[in-house]
């Protein structure tokens, strides 16, 4: 029962951070203008993996794609490539811990194969959530160096009088999303890898002895021994619901008639 | 169309408060800021303030503040600027307007003259 | 704040000939974010609101003549009207659109020659 609950848990947390981290991937805000020392702003500029976002007072929304690939920073394409591998990972893990799941029963699959494919998803969650945490890990460091360089040449001066304002930078909400995902991820993986070591049949091989009776020639031949745990059958008729993730890039306070690509 | 109508002239003795209103119609009033703008006689152009009638949050200019309050009545699309402890230099046409892209001000009331004088 | 300053404060064109007005931000008003800069261009004849012509610094608003047209980035930007009429007789304001609070140039008073 604990080794179902266990495994059920599992694939409930991972299921959550796969969609988080989804959610967190195409999120716009993986950078924001950084309003510190002037929190109410005509202009508000953030960044995303795909495209960069300029939200301004008056409520209308203009978003651009990256549309070049060679033009981009290394660093982009590396958070890019952690997260959409982080994803796919996550997605056939998802796929095999299904099939996996003790409560359900596919044709006479034996438990050994189900502890097998349980820790086959339990290791794809866990490196899902690493490249998850890896990539918003990359992107955070990458801000912290740039904010800081962009600090260090905040006011440009341009014929004395005259000034340009750089445009610093710091963490949005979608790295938040992701650390909390990668970190949902890498938990559910771990609890399948646990919950497989529950299922793995400890089956004590007795060699095949054969006991000779008078006047009956029965033989005995006991083999690996398996505990039934009442779950083969689903008599509970219970439903598989397979929840669709919705994702909000960010709250606007106008309506979606207001942005415009 | 989007039409701004503002309420009549008003003539106030220095110390008072003057509150001007401007009915929005033509468009969902809750969807666009509404910019306030003053033009003194013979002079430019100056932004006292816009508010946000979804949130009521607005957002002044510093020279202006502590002395002007915008607010919304949504169930009448109907915004209002009360400027207090009046001084002869704030007689001006006041103007509210309103936001398009750009931050630009496409739409504009039709203004308010306020007379400061003893 | 950002100051604007305009000019010249007056100008004085012939019917048909090309006006032009400068306006200069202290500050630049280009955003990076999507390399548009925050200035707009008003209209105002006597007795009348302010006519939205230009945002963006050089996008023209929708019922503008194409005889006005706005250029320039950073902190220094013009207002062109090709081809002078009559009704172009006003004057002409810029505004900074980027950072609170908003401002405007003095004002350049357009006449005829």
């Known amino acids: 029962m604990a080794v179902t609950a266990c495994q059920g848990l599992g694939f409930v947390v991972s299921l959550i951070g796969i969609a988080g981290i989804i959610a967190a991937t195409c999120m716009d805000q993986w950078s924001t203008q950084d309003l510190y020392n002037n929190p109410v702003t005509a202009v508000f500029n953030y960044q995303g993996l795909w495209r960069s976002c300029v939200r301004e007072s008056s409520g209308f929304t203009e978003c651009r794609g990256y549309f070049t690939l060679l033009g981009l920073p290394a660093m982009l394409q590396a958070v890019r490539a952690l997260m959409i591998v982080g994803i796919v990972l996550g997605a056939i893990g998802l796929l095999v811990s299904i099939f996996a799941l003790k409560c359900i029963r596919i044709g006479s699959m034996e438990d050994s194969a189900k502890a097998n494919m349980t820790l086959t998803s339990g290791i794809m969650f866990i490196v899902s959530g690493l490249c998850a945490i890896a990539g918003v890990s990359v992107f955070a460091n990458m801000l912290v160096t740039n904010f800081w360089m962009s600090t260090a040449n905040m006011y440009t001066g341009m014929g004395g009088m005259v000034q340009t304002v750089q445009t610093r930078y710091t963490f949005g909400a979608a790295l938040f999303v992701g650390w909390v995902a990668g970190g949902l991820t890498l938990i559910g993986g771990v609890m399948m890898c646990i919950a497989c070591r529950g299922l793995a049949p400890e089956e004590t091989n007795y060699k095949a002895v054969s006991y000779h009776a008078s006047g009956h020639s029965v033989a005995y031949k006991p083999g690996g021994f398996k505990a039934s745990t009442g779950f083969g059958s689903n008599t509970k008729n219970k439903k598989i619901y397979d929840g669709g993730a919705r994702t909000e890039d960010e709250v606007q306070s106008y309506p979606s008639k207001h942005d415009y690509v | 169309q989007i039409q701004l109508v503002q309420s009549g002239a008003e003539v106030k003795k220095p110390g008072a408060s003057v509150k001007i209103s401007c009915k929005a119609s033509g468009y969902s009033f809750t969807d666009y800021h509404m910019n306030w703008v003053r033009q003194a006689p013979g002079k430019g152009l100056e932004w006292i303030g816009n508010?946000?009638?979804?949130?009521?949050?607005?957002t002044y200019n510093h020279k202006f503040k502590g002395r002007v309050t915008l607010t919304v009545d949504t169930s009448t699309s109907t915004a209002y600027m009360e400027l207090s402890s009046l001084r002869s230099e704030d007689t001006a046409v006041y103007y509210c307007?309103?936001?398009?892209?750009?931050?630009?001000?496409?739409?504009w009331g039709q203004g308010t003259l306020v007379t400061v004088s003893s | 704040d950002i100051v604007m300053t305009q000019s010249p404060s007056s100008l004085a064109v012939s019917l048909g000939e090309r006006a032009t007005i400068n306006c200069k931000s202290s500050q630049s008003l280009l955003n990076s974010g999507n390399q548009r800069n925050y200035l707009t261009w008003y209209q105002q004849k006597p007795g009348q609101p302010p006519k939205l012509l230009i945002y963006?610094?050089?996008t023209r608003e929708s019922g503008v003549p194409d005889r006005f047209s706005g250029s320039g980035s950073g902190t220094d930007f013009t207002l062109t009207i090709s081809s002078l009429q009559a009704e172009d007789v006003a004057v002409y304001y810029c505004?900074?659109?980027?950072?609170?609070?908003?401002?405007f140039g003095q004002g350049t008073k357009l006449e005829i020659k």
């Open positions: 508010i946000d009638p979804y949130y009521g949050s607005p």
């Open positions: 505004q900074n659109d980027y950072s609170f609070p908003f401002t």
């Open positions: 307007a309103n936001y398009g892209r750009g931050n630009s001000f496409p739409y």
């Open positions: 963006w610094a050089s």
